[in-house]
């Protein structure tokens, strides 16, 4: 049964951030969206291949919530929350979409305190992660995807370079949180950032609502 939907990128699990496969089969039952079935903690999850029983590939579904409790680290000083997806491997476009699906954006770093806080969370890891830096706009120049002002800079030496091919930014543990520009299409881990909004309603991703389902003969939507 085929269904047009926005790809929902998974968090954690064992699928490296790959999107949900909809529908998927779990415990002899077909699911057309994220489910908490089989979980005592109530977290919504999905399979990333059609048959969970066969492949056992899964991840948690992104949730837009007004807190930073699940999957997020909160900086008590600034109230900003951060999500480090070390096990994921997504392009910058996919990483940006994953953050957006959680009411967040890719990481922006606007002051030295924030850089220091991020460096602390990166301690012990060896990784290169997508952040919100990009020069994808024709108006020119590097910018943050969440439109924060680019007032603090931490480029590595000789960076950015190669303007026609490397238009998205990464943060690297190898250079103590220094920034580089890279080809946006390569698959890397990524960091999301959000500011909790007291008025926001928690909304699970019901991206399959009100969508026409097209099924093979003998299948039921």
């Amino acid at each position: 049964c085929a269904l047009p939907y926005h790809e929902v990128y998974t968090i954690q699990g064992n699928s490296h951030g790959k999107p949900c496969t909809i529908p998927f089969k779990y415990d002899n039952q077909w699911f057309h969206g994220c489910t908490s079935t089989g979980r005592e903690d109530g977290h919504l999850w999905c399979a990333t291949t059609q048959d969970y029983g066969k492949d056992e590939r899964w991840g948690f579904c992104p949730i837009k919530s007004n807190d930073c409790e699940t999957f997020w680290d909160k900086d008590q000083l600034t109230d900003s929350c951060y999500q480090f997806n070390f096990q994921s491997t997504l392009s910058w476009r996919e990483a940006w979409a994953s953050c957006e699906q959680q009411g967040a954006d890719l990481l922006s770093i606007t002051e030295i305190h924030e850089q220091t806080y991020i460096n602390g969370l990166l301690t012990g890891y060896s990784s290169t992660l997508w952040i919100g830096l990009n020069d994808l706009d024709t108006s020119g120049g590097w910018q943050w995807s969440d439109n924060s002002p680019l007032k603090y800079l931490n480029w590595e030496s000789d960076q950015p370079d190669n303007p026609s091919e490397e238009n998205c930014g990464v943060i690297r543990t190898e250079s103590s949180g220094g920034w580089q520009n890279r080809d946006c299409s390569i698959a890397l881990p990524y960091v999301c950032k959000k500011k909790p909004n007291a008025t926001a309603e928690p909304t699970p991703p019901d991206r399959w609502a009100n969508v026409k389902v097209e099924c093979e003969p003998s299948w039921q939507p």
Epitope: E7, S91, R93, E94, N134, D135, L136, D137, T138, N162, P163, S164, E165, N167, D183, C184, S185, A187
Partner: antibody, heavy 117, light 108 residues
Framework: EVQLVESGGGLVKPGGSLRLSCAAS????????MNWVRQAPGKGLEWVAN????????HSVDSVKGRFTISRDNSKNSLYLQMNSLRAEDTAVYYC??????????WGQGTLVTVSS | SSELTQDPAVSVALGQTVRITCQGD??????ASWYQQKPGQAPVLVVY???GRPSGIPDRFSGSSSGNTASLTITGAQAEDEADYYC???????????FGGGTKVTVL
């Protein structure tokens, strides 16, 4: 203002050769990869070849491999396409295009190559 | 054959809305760009990345994408929008650019 101006097109017999040129101005040519894109009469756009800023890496579509060579002269702000063993199916308008971020944001006006006996 | 797939032709009544789609594996990892081409002219970039427009492009042109599909929407189509539209994206390191086959938009 970014400008790309192609030249060198014309009528050539099958098996013949042509060298296209693209004169670039208004930007730091040596910082950008450059591309040739073609369009056969009444058909769609087809990427032909690409060259890195320093000329160290070149790629081309399979149908022109071994026949077409892309090159550049950064001191002259110029891009070239040497076309050998031309075939009727190579008849097209050839555009020089500069990439921006994930797009080809500047194009020349094109030069027509006609391969016919 | 194109690495990106577009419908060959669509028509739209003057002032109405038309949506052109483009599908391909490279769109999972890359943003699409859209070009307008009128007869005898070079392609002109109209929409890029998430939903950016170069200066001089009217705001009736907009873009969106999800998964392996990108869309160009013309809201309130004008007679001057009649043209061929091509989608394009970064592709692979050895074949850096992919193009769709083009969609001819006719304004009735």
């Amino acid at each position: 203002e970014v400008q790309l101006v192609e030249s060198g097109g014309g009528l050539v017999k099958p098996g013949g050769s042509l060298r296209l040129s693209c004169a670039a101005s208004g930007f730091t040519f040596s910082s950008y990869s450059m591309n040739w894109v073609r369009q056969a009469p009444g058909k769609g756009l087809e990427w032909v070849a690409n060259i890195k800023p320093d000329g160290s890496e070149r790629h081309s579509v399979d149908s022109v491999k071994g026949r077409f060579t892309i090159s550049r002269d950064n001191s002259k702000n110029s891009l070239y396409l040497q076309m050998n063993s031309l075939r009727a199916e190579d008849t097209a308008v050839y555009y020089c295009a500069r990439p921006g971020a994930g797009r080809l944001d500047y194009w020349g006006q094109g030069t027509l190559v006609t391969v016919s006996s | 054959s194109s690495e990106l797939t577009q419908d060959p032709a669509v028509s739209v009544a003057l002032g109405q809305t038309v949506r052109i789609t483009c599908q391909g594996d490279s769109l999972r990892s890359n943003f699409a760009s859209w070009y307008q081409q009128k007869p005898g002219q070079a392609p002109v970039l109209v929409v890029y990345v998430k939903n950016g427009r170069p200066s001089g492009i009217p705001d009736r042109f907009s873009g969106s994408s999800s998964g392996n599909t990108a869309s160009l929407t013309i809201t309130g189509a004008q007679a001057e929008d009649e043209a061929d539209y091509y989608c394009n994206s970064r592709n692979s390191s050895t074949h850096p650019w992919a193009f769709g086959g083009g969609t001819k938009v006719t304004v009735l």
